[in-house]
């Protein structure tokens, strides 16, 4: 019961996490700039992985996609890749984990197969979560290093000048969504891996035993039959029955009409 609960909870937590990773990847507010000192109008500029938007105090909002791969920072491309890999792995993990759920019966699937699938999905969730956390952290690091650099003039030429604008750069909501979602996916993956241990069937080691009845009427001790699992006291192939039962190691075959082998 605890295993089913752990597996189910792991699946739900991972599902929420992956939904969050998808949401964060699609969100526009990865970084925001509040251009409070703009002489014309208050401008709120924000960027995502796929497009950049501007919102003015008048309510005017416009977004434009990055239609080219060239000319974009390598870090941005790396973040995009990490987030997409996280989503793909997470999606595959969800698909695998649905079939691995103990509460769902699919044909005559054995517990060992479900255990393997649970472990596979768990590992996928862990990697997915790590990809999302890494992606968001790389972007956050890019913002910090990029915007704490000197805001001196970038170049001057022909009397003209290009310089960076002094703005309040802040982490966008998508970064926090990504961190939380990545963490949830990671936790869900760990829970699936824990559930896998409980799902794996314990191997039952039935030792080969030969029974030698010494007479027609053999008194068997009630409850005397024990299947050795390797965890009990009968680990050294000792005699289990007093009534002439011997293990293969100890057997001395005397021809008898009562032999059962």
């Amino acid at each position: 019961m605890a295993v089913t609960a752990c597996q189910g909870l792991g699946f739900v937590v991972s599902l929420i996490g992956i939904a969050g990773i998808i949401a964060a990847t699609c969100m526009d507010q990865w970084s925001t700039q509040d251009l409070y000192n703009n002489p014309v109008t208050a401008v709120f500029n924000y960027q995502g992985l796929w497009r950049s938007c501007v919102r003015e105090s008048s309510g005017f909002t416009e977004c434009r996609g990055y239609f080219t791969l060239l000319g974009l920072p390598a870090m941005l491309q790396a973040v995009r890749a990490l987030m997409i890999v996280g989503i793909v792995l997470g999606a595959i993990g969800l698909l695998v984990s649905i079939f691995a759920l103990k509460c769902i019966r699919i044909g005559s699937m054995e517990d060992s197969a479900k255990a393997n699938m649970t472990l596979t999905s768990g590992i996928m969730f862990i990697v997915s979560g790590l990809c999302a956390i890494a992606g968001v952290s790389v972007f956050a690091n890019m913002l910090v290093t990029n915007f704490w650099m000197s805001t001196a003039n970038m170049y001057t030429g022909m009397g003209g000048m290009v310089q960076t604008v002094q703005t309040r750069y802040t982490f966008g909501a998508a970064l926090f969504v990504g961190w939380v979602a990545g963490g949830l996916t990671l936790i869900g993956g760990v829970m699936m891996c824990i559930a896998c241990r409980g799902l794996a069937p314990e191997e039952t080691n039935y030792k080969a035993v030969s029974y030698h009845a010494s007479g027609h009427s053999v008194a068997y001790k009630p409850g005397g039959f024990k299947a050795s699992t390797g965890f009990g006291s009968n680990t050294k192939n000792k005699k289990i029955y007093d009534g002439g039962a011997r293990t293969e190691d100890e057997v001395q075959s005397y021809p008898s009409k009562h032999d059962y082998v």
Epitope: V40, V54, P73, V162, T164, V165
Partner: nanobody, 121 residues
Framework: EVQVQESGGGLVQAGTSLRLSCAAS????????MGWYRQAPGKQRELVAG???????TYAHSVKERFTISRDNAKNTMYLQMNSLKSEDTAGYYC???????????????WGQGTLVTVSA
Amino acid sequence: EVQVQESGGGLVQAGTSLRLSCAASGNIFRIDTMGWYRQAPGKQRELVAGISRGGTTTYAHSVKERFTISRDNAKNTMYLQMNSLKSEDTAGYYCNAQAWDPGTFRYLEVWGQGTLVTVSA
């Protein structure tokens, strides 16, 4: 890189009109606000008029009724229609553009080299 170039300046009589143009060129992603600044000899640079991407405008008190700023977002061009010019309008007029640059993931402020407007009495 983004560059801006002013044009339309020159010597005019007081009371007449003049139209300045500012064209942005280069690797432009999106220009948000554009403005005209002027600097008379021995004075500080001041904002004359500005216009946002959404069309919000602002003017200096001294030019409010006489000057009109307009913009063509598609062409990345801004205009300043100057009517009833006065001798105190004599100055170097500079174009300013604030643009987002995805290449550096920074907000850039671009200045032109200026165009001289001389109003004779």
